[in-house]
Amino acid sequence: SGLNDIFEAQKIEWHELPRWRQQWSGSGTTSRFPETVLARCVKYTEVHPEMRHVDCQSVWDAFKGAFISKYPCNITEEDYQPLVKLGTQTVPCNKTLLWSRIKDLAHQFTQVQRDMFTLEDMLLGYLADDLTWCGEFNTFEINYQSCPDWRKDCSNNPVSVFWKTVSRRFAETACGVVHVMLNGSRSKIFDKNSTFGSVEVHNLQPEKVQALEAWVIHGGREDSRDLCQDPTIKELESIISKRNIRFFCKNIYRPDKFLQCVKNPEDSSCLSGI
C-alpha cells in the first residue's frame, strides 16, 4: 500500500509523518467507541452470568492497549493476546455455529436456538460486532476521522487483525460437530478468502472436531437445486477431509421456514423438508 511504500523507500519513522499524512481510505472509529465497548461488556456479563468474573474496565484497558499509540497498519495478533486472555470463554461441544456471508440469519438462528453460539454471541465478538476502531502512532488519540481499509490501505489494521485473532481462537476451541451457515446466493458459496475460508477452516482441531456440517441457505423461493454439489462446496469438503474431519452438507431451501421450525419444532409443516 502507499504508506508502506513510503516507509520502505524513504525509511521515514512513523512518528515523523506529518499528521495530514495519516488519512486512511476507510471510515473512522465508531462514535463513542470506548463507551460502547464498556457498556456492551457490562450488559454481556449481566446476561451471561457465567462471565460475571470478568472485570469490564480491565477488558477495555486490554482492548485499548491493543491499538492505541500503535501504527494502525502494523497491528499483530500478539497485540490482542491480553484481551483474548481476559475474554476466554468456552462453548459446549456440538454448539459452535460458524457463518460466512450470512451473518443476519446465523444470528437470528442463535437468538432462537439459545444453546448454539456464533462468534458474536461470545463476549469478544459481541463487544466488537459492527464497530470500527483505530489509533495513531505515538499518540493516545483514537482516530475518529479515518481508519485503514483492508484492500486500499493494509490488511494488518486493528479491526481485521482483531477478527482474525478471535476467529482463530473460536475455531481452535470448537469441539464435536461444528456447524457452518453458508450463503447459497453468492457466486462462491464457499469462499477461500472469507474469514471462514482463510482462518476458521484451517484452525478446527481434528483431534477435537469430529465433523463439519455445512448448511447451504437458498435465496430464491423456487430454487430446488442441490447446492451441496456446488464446486466450491466440493472444494470445502476436500479441504476438510484432508484435515481428517468428516464433512456433511445440507440444503436449507426455505430459510424462513427453517427459522420458524426452530422456534416451533412441533409444527406439523416442520415434519416435511426445509
Epitope: P49, H53, P92
Partner: antibody, heavy 114, light 113 residues
C-alpha cells in the same frame, strides 16, 4: 459482611408469601444474589438468582412458582402460590465470581399447611 | 435438565482417615471446571469449601482438596477430623441461556467415628 433472611412463617396453601434478604457490609448493586431452599431432611435446591442490574434467572422447575426482585437494600423472593411441597428452609446467598455462594444467611423456615 | 449425582450418599470414616466423595454431572460444567463443594452442619447454612474444582475458599483447612474436569469431580478429605462430620454438596454451574445456571448434587453425609 453478612446476609439475613426474614419473612418465613406458617401459611396456608395458595397464600402468596414474600421472603426478604437483607445485606450488611456490602452493596447489592455489586453482587448477584441467589435463593436456595432445603426441605426438612433433604438436600439443597437452587431456586434462582438476580443479577447486579436486576436480571433474574430461575431453575426450570421454579419458573412461574417464584419471583425474585430487589431494591437497593434487599432482595425479595415471592412464593406465588405455595403448596405443601414448598415447606423448607429458604437461604439467601451472595454469588461470587466462581461459585453459587460465598456468603450465606442462617435461613428462614416456611411451613405450608392447611 | 442437568443432574449432579453424588456418591456415596453416606460414608463413615475414622479420625485421621481419608474420605473421597464423587460428583458426576450429566453434562460438562461451564468451562469444564465451574464446580464447587459446600459443607453443611446440622441446623447451619452451607459453607463454601472449594470453588472452580480445586481452589480452596478462604479459611478452609488444606486437608480439603478437589479435583476433576468436565463431568467427573472428587472431593477428598485427608486426615479427617471429628469436626468434619457434616453433609457435603457439590454444585455445578452451566450456561444460563441454555440450562439451569446452578445445580446441586444430592449430598453425602460424612460420619466420623
Amino acid at each position: 459482611q453478612s446476609v439475613e433472611e426474614s419473612g418465613g412463617r406458617l401459611v396456608t396453601p395458595g397464600t402468596p408469601l414474600t421472603l426478604t434478604c437483607t445485606a450488611s457490609g456490602f452493596s447489592l448493586s455489586s453482587y448477584y444474589m441467589s435463593w436456595v431452599r432445603q426441605a426438612p431432611g433433604k438436600g439443597l435446591e437452587w431456586i434462582g438468582f438476580i443479577s447486579k442490574t436486576a436480571i433474574t434467572y430461575y431453575a426450570s422447575w421454579a419458573r412461574g412458582r417464584f419471583t425474585i426482585s430487589k431494591t437497593s437494600t434487599a432482595v425479595d423472593l415471592k412464593i406465588t402460590s405455595p403448596t405443601t411441597e414448598d415447606t423448607a428452609t429458604y437461604f439467601c446467598a451472595r454469588v461470587d465470581a466462581y461459585s453459587a455462594g460465598d456468603l450465606w444467611g442462617p435461613g428462614t423456615l416456611v411451613t405450608v399447611s392447611s | 435438565a442437568q443432574v449432579l449425582t453424588q456418591t456415596p450418599s453416606s460414608v463413615s470414616a475414622a479420625v485421621g482417615g481419608t474420605v473421597t466423595i464423587n460428583c458426576q454431572a450429566s453434562q460438562s460444567v461451564y468451562s469444564d471446571n465451574r464446580l464447587s463443594w459446600f459443607q453443611q452442619k446440622s441446623g447451619q447454612p452451607p459453607k463454601l469449601l472449594i470453588y472452580s474444582t480445586s481452589s480452596l475458599a478462604s479459611g478452609v483447612p488444606s486437608r480439603f482438596s478437589g479435583s476433576g474436569s468436565g463431568t467427573q469431580f472428587t472431593l477428598t478429605i485427608s486426615g479427617v477430623q471429628s469436626d468434619d462430620a457434616a453433609s457435603y454438596y457439590c454444585q455445578g454451574e452451566f450456561i444460563c441461556t441454555s440450562a439451569d445456571c446452578f445445580v446441586f448434587g444430592g449430598g453425602t453425609e460424612v460420619v466420623v467415628k
